[in-house]
């Protein structure tokens, strides 16, 4: 049985300065090349090492790019989006949607979006047990008074 995976969606404005090798990332998606089913949006497929995006550090692989210099990326062919980035100029403003994976699964299941490696039950069970022991000890102590 798999856990239910939820996503925490946040938006961010990222300003990049074009480097010698461009903006330093690859994109996928578009109306003619859907990356996510039922979504023709433009997604970051790869961040190039030592490129402008990697050095900035905020853009992540899997991020959805909503706009470039205020130009909406909805319903674009893939190559139209590529050319928009290519001709966006030296200073480029990106509106980006990050999706942080959150695990709400069955006990003991650890999702890839939970990097800490401590399932919540491992914290809750001892706390609950301690509370019960404390309550039992308190009741016994009261009875002795």
């Amino acid at each position: 049985m798999n856990g239910r995976v939820d996503y925490l969606v946040t938006e961010e404005e990222i300003n990049l300065t074009r480097g010698p090798s461009g903006l330093g990332f690859n994109i996928v998606g578009g109306t003619d090349q859907q990356y996510v089913s039922n979504d023709s949006g433009i997604y970051v497929s790869r961040i190039k090492e030592n490129g402008a995006a990697a050095l900035d550090g905020r853009l992540q692989e899997g991020d959805k790019i909503l706009s470039v210099n205020g130009q909406d990326l909805k319903n674009l062919l893939h190559q139209d989006a590529v050319d928009l980035f290519r001709n966006a100029g030296y200073a480029v403003s990106l509106r980006v949607q990050h999706r942080l994976q959150v695990q709400n699964g069955p006990i003991g299941h650890r999702g890839e979006g939970d990097p800490s490696g401590i399932p919540i039950f491992m914290v809750l069970v001892p706390v609950f047990a301690l509370t019960m022991v404390a309550a039992w000890a308190f009741m016994r102590y009261r009875q002795q008074l």
């Epitope: 674009l76 062919l77 893939h78 139209d80 989006a81 050319d83 928009l84 290519r86 001709n87």
Partner: nanobody, 124 residues
């Protein structure tokens, strides 16, 4: 994959007419241009049209004899050529601007990133 496919070329008598078509796929909202290249000569600008179809420019050698148009629903550009002369004999190329929704049309060959294979026009 971006593709531009020209059609409509052929052999025509001097004074005759031809209508060339250019079907575009893989890109949209592009300024479109027609260029031609005669044997042993450089590629020459013929005509261009804005992505919205509201603005056109023409090369000096064809002014008044050709009309460029487009049908965005079909993603196709056209070149209507009248009063053809033997010196119009060339391979005619269709090209799409490398910029998405570019502001100004241009005769500058360097701005056209996408090219068709060309269609031969021979005027006898």
């Amino acid at each position: 994959e971006v593709q531009l496919v020209e059609s409509g070329g052929g052999l025509v008598q001097a004074g005759g007419s031809l209508r060339l078509s250019c079907a575009v796929s893989g890109v949209s909202f592009r300024n479109m241009g027609w260029f031609r290249q005669a044997p042993g000569k450089e590629r020459e600008f013929v005509a261009a049209i804005s992505w919205g179809g509201d603005s056109t420019i023409y090369g000096d050698s064809v002014k008044g004899r050709v009309t460029i148009s487009r049908d965005n629903a079909k993603n196709t550009a056209y070149l209507e050529m009248n009063s053809l002369k033997p010196e119009d004999t060339a391979v005619y190329y269709c090209a799409a601007d490398g910029r998405f929704r570019a502001g100004r049309i241009s005769s500058d060959l360097g701005l056209y990133h996408y090219w068709g294979q060309g269609t031969q026009v021979t005027v006898s």
